[in-house]
């Protein structure tokens, strides 16, 4: 906490500029008008204020806006955003995607901090759902964002937003999350033709039920082993040898290398040896 002291003569800041980096903390407190700071926040980001000086500027804004900052200030916080606590951010009402982008840019290249997580939560709750533009923005900054959400939170993702999802955005999703996302993806891509549909749906198939896998096996999709290994075990078990052969196409030979791993191991144990032998891979049930 900086003591309240009078501003020395001639030191009152007429504007926010680089000369303020030469001010001591108490001079910043005494000589910078909080309302001026709020209107010229966009300049702060370009000025190499120290960590300690930014503390003083934050303190001034906190005093000016005890109920939370207006969006006009939030959008231009820049590096001052890194000073905010989740408690500070919970007071904000962020509605503009531009504001969200500006603050995510500040944290770019770093892991998602508690501040960023709180900001995103506030933003999404304010919008009521995770729309396509928001999802586009969030996954661009944090490819793992979607998989950080609970199945309950994912249920608010409208099918139309699924178009924004890239395969790498699903890399860390677990089966429970894919169970929620798969039906949305199926709905989103339902009007696409066979091969195009498979390209889009492929990364969501970890949530697919048996009947959908059976349907895919009739479409010459040539699923790769990496995708097959991510399928739900309970969805794979009822598939016949012929269906798996059709599903994998030329990739069926890869089953041998994966015979000790789920779901391949469990599927092999469910098959008749005669049927497995038709594959000519030496798989032992």
């Amino acid at each position: 906490e900086v003591e309240k002291t009078a501003c020395p003569s001639g030191k009152k800041a007429p504007e926010i500029d680089e000369s303020l980096i030469f001010y001591k903390k108490w001079e910043l407190e005494a000589c910078v008008d909080a309302a001026l700071l709020a209107t010229q926040m966009d300049r702060v980001n370009a000025i190499p204020f120290t960590y300690e000086q930014l503390d003083v500027l934050k303190h001034k804004l906190d005093e000016l806006y005890p109920q939370g900052y207006p969006e006009s200030v939030i959008q231009h916080l820049g590096y001052l955003f890194l000073k905010m606590s989740p408690e500070d951010i919970r007071k904000w009402n962020v509605t503009s995607l531009e504001t969200l982008k500006a603050l995510l840019e500040v944290n770019k290249g770093h892991e998602m901090s508690p501040q960023v997580a709180t900001l995103i939560d506030r933003f999404v709750k304010g919008r009521g759902q995770l729309d396509k533009d928001t999802l586009d923005t969030l996954t661009a900054f944090y490819p793992g964002y979607l998989c950080s959400l609970s199945p309950e939170e994912l249920s608010s993702v409208p099918p139309s937003s699924i178009w924004a999802v890239r395969p790498q955005d699903l890399d860390t999703c677990d089966p429970r999350q894919l169970d929620v996302l798969y039906p949305k993806a199926r709905l989103a891509f339902q009007n696409m033709n066979g091969s195009e549909y498979f390209v889009k749906i492929q990364s969501f198939l970890g949530g697919a039920p048996t009947e959908d896998l059976k349907a895919l096996s009739q479409q010459n999709v040539s699923m790769d082993l990496a995708t097959f290994m991510k399928l739900r075990t309970d969805a794979v078990l009822p598939l016949t040898v012929a269906e798996v052969q059709k599903l994998l196409g030329p990739h069926v030979e890869g089953l041998k290398a994966e015979e000790r791993h789920r779901p391949v191991r469990d599927w092999i144990l469910r098959q008749r040896q005669d049927d497995l032998d038709t594959l000519g891979l030496g798989l032992q049930g």
Partner: nanobody, 116 residues
Framework: QVQLVESGGGLVQPGGSLRLSCAAS????????VAWYRQAPGKEREAVAV???????KYADSVKGRFTISRYNAKNIAYLQMNSLKPEDTAVYYC??????????WGQGTQVTVSS
Amino acid sequence: QVQLVESGGGLVQPGGSLRLSCAASGSIFSGNAVAWYRQAPGKEREAVAVITRDGDTKYADSVKGRFTISRYNAKNIAYLQMNSLKPEDTAVYYCNTARGAAVDSWGQGTQVTVSS
């Protein structure tokens, strides 16, 4: 993570000169202001000079007329030419940008000692 490396410090007599250099590992200087700071033992870090991305310069009152800050964007280097050095200029000198200073990320600095 951007690395800033300061060099050029040393022991110099009062009235002498030194030229400090600050090299950045990334192309961070081109779009950002760069500042030189110093920290004397037992004192808080203070800014001594700043150069904006457009090349405008500003100085702390205590070094005006004696220190000159400059930059060479193509090489990601900033300089601090220090003339007419005084014993009270003795400190560790650091350079930084807005991002680095904001997150309290600093280089190792370079020691300047002014003594007879």
